[in-house]
């Protein structure tokens, strides 16, 4: 399969895709939605000691194929050239979500023993800074 | 992560060759002029959030705990995306017409995974 | 094999204008940049500018930005380059040349035309 | 933009002598896009030595090129009859591209 679509010229473009990811998405739709989560409702209290809870953000919307005249390029941030042939190709649907590698940490202390004792860990890749069709 | 190979349709990635010459981009990205970028398709059923390699993060999985609980945010929508980008070295044209030669960072869909 | 045909000659009145024609062969015409050097009588090279069959993308050197316009017809695999107000500065041989890719990231002027000589007389 | 100067601008060699011209930049340029090209009189110029170092197809190995930043060299380690023509050096790494005034080399 190739991609139906051609896309206008742009000698910038590789500055743009490094520059850091714009809220909203350029999919009005994809965005970035707060929840406060406790690790109770999780059943992770037991292991999770501290935070008791946390403002968790996940990515909702949709990424509907209409591509503004003006937009030249994908979502800057995104991959660059995959990420708008993606929704060119069967079968390939751009999905609206957190930005592969900019997802960040939470610490928290936890506990395997009860709470007699604790240790410091770090929860990989738990908050979204940044939504995109992708 | 897993592979297409045309006997599944959960999450995997989808060997594509990305042609430069046919998206219109060959006047600007001077070489290489076509590579293989890849792309991620397939179901995204809630059970895979368990499995090892295919849920894309632990964030993945505070999402699924939440669904199988059928607790909000019930309409967030599983789907398959890029969980691992590799960098390619490429030559292009700057906007002056300078010319760059720069690893590019997100440029090539290693894995896949349901997020 | 690659070929590129450009007529041997022109004589232009000052003032006026002429539009160069180079006509590639032997390769897909869409996929490389095409440039134009300009040489005086017993001088050397000028780079004049370039353009992408593609997209009719173009690069001017600044000094002839004003003097040479650059079009393509892609139906028939041909440049053109347009130059006006005619001065005897612009009496030169004007060479239309493909810009190739030699691999390992490398290119290069690699395939040239034969040149048109172009004579700016009353 | 980047001037090339070439010297010298005319030379003389002996058949079988060890030739060297320079091409020097007011600015630096990344060897990966500096290029000779070979001229012979009333024809167009030939693609000769490309990325600085690498003989264009059909280049006799007894030229070599070399440099880097703002310094750059053709050679010819033995002078031969058809070697006396002129020689341009050529940067495509910052816009105008630009030519050297050229070398003419001569028989001795």
């Known amino acids: 399969s190739t991609p139906l679509m051609s896309w206008p010229w742009s000698p910038s473009a590789l500055r743009l895709l490094q520059r850091p990811p714009e809220e909203p998405a350029a999919h009005a739709n994809c965005h970035r939605v707060a929840l406060n989560i406790s690790f109770q409702e999780l059943g992770w209290e037991r292991w999770i000691v501290y935070p008791p809870s946390f403002i968790f953000h996940y990515c909702h919307g949709g990424c509907g194929l209409h591509i503004p005249p003006n937009l030249s390029l994908p979502v800057p941030g995104a991959p660059p050239t995959p990420a708008q042939p993606y929704s060119l190709l069967p079968g390939a649907q751009p999905c609206c979500a957190a930005l592969p590698g900019t997802m960040r940490p939470l610490h928290v202390r936890t506990t395997s023993d009860g709470g007699y004792s604790f240790k410091y860990e770090t929860v990989p890749n738990l908050l979204t800074q940044h939504c995109a069709c992708i | 992560g897993l592979e297409c190979d045309g006997r599944t349709n959960l999450c995997c990635r989808q060997q594509f060759f990305i042609d430069f010459r046919l998206i219109g981009w060959n006047d600007w990205i001077i070489a290489p002029t076509g590579y293989y970028g890849n792309y991620c398709e397939g179901s995204c059923p809630a059970y895979l959030a368990g499995v090892p390699g295919s849920a894309s993060s632990f964030h993945t999985a505070v999402v699924n705990q939440y669904r199988m609980r059928g607790l909000n945010p019930g309409t967030v929508n599983s789907c398959c995306i890029p969980t691992k980008l590799s960098t390619m070295s490429m030559l292009y044209f700057d906007d002056e017409y300078n010319i760059v030669k720069r690893d590019v960072p997100n440029m090539i869909v290693e894995e896949c995974g349901c997020a | 094999q690659v070929q590129l045909q450009q007529p041997g000659a022109e004589l232009v009145k000052p003032g006026a204008s002429v539009k160069l024609s180079c006509k590639a062969s032997?390769?897909?015409?869409?996929?490389?940049?095409m440039y134009w050097v300009k040489q005086r009588p017993g001088q050397g090279l000028e780079w004049i500018g370039m353009?992408?069959?593609?997209?009719?993308?173009?690069n001017y050197n600044g000094k002839f930005k004003t003097g040479a316009t650059l079009t393509v017809d892609k139906s028939s695999s041909t440049v053109y380059m347009q130059l006006s107000s005619l001065t005897s500065e612009d009496s030169a041989v004007y060479y239309c040349?493909?810009?190739?890719?030699?691999?390992?990231?490398?290119?290069?002027?690699?395939?040239w035309g034969q040149g048109t000589s172009v004579t700016v007389s009353s | 933009q980047i001037v090339l100067t070439q010297s010298p601008a005319i030379m003389s060699a002996s058949l079988g002598e060890r030739v060297t011209m320079t091409c020097t930049a007011s600015?630096?340029?990344?060897?990966?896009?500096f290029h000779w090209y070979q001229q012979k009189p009333g024809s167009s110029p030939k693609l000769w030595i490309y990325?600085?170092?690498n003989l264009a197809s059909g280049v006799p190995a007894r030229f070599s090129g070399s440099g880097s930043g703002t310094s750059y060299s053709l050679t010819i380690s033995t002078m031969e009859a058809e070697d006396a023509v002129t020689y341009y050096c050529?940067?495509?790494?910052?816009?105008?591209?630009?030519f050297g005034g050229g070398t003419k080399l001569e028989i001795k």
């Open positions: 040349a493909r810009w190739g890719y030699g691999g390992n990231y490398d290119y290069a002027m690699d395939y």
């Open positions: 032997g390769y897909t015409f869409t996929n490389y940049w």
């Open positions: 353009i992408h069959p593609n997209s009719g993308s173009t």
């Open positions: 600015s630096s340029v990344s060897s990966s896009y």
């Open positions: 990325s600085t170092s």
């Open positions: 050529h940067q495509y790494h910052r816009s105008p591209w630009t």
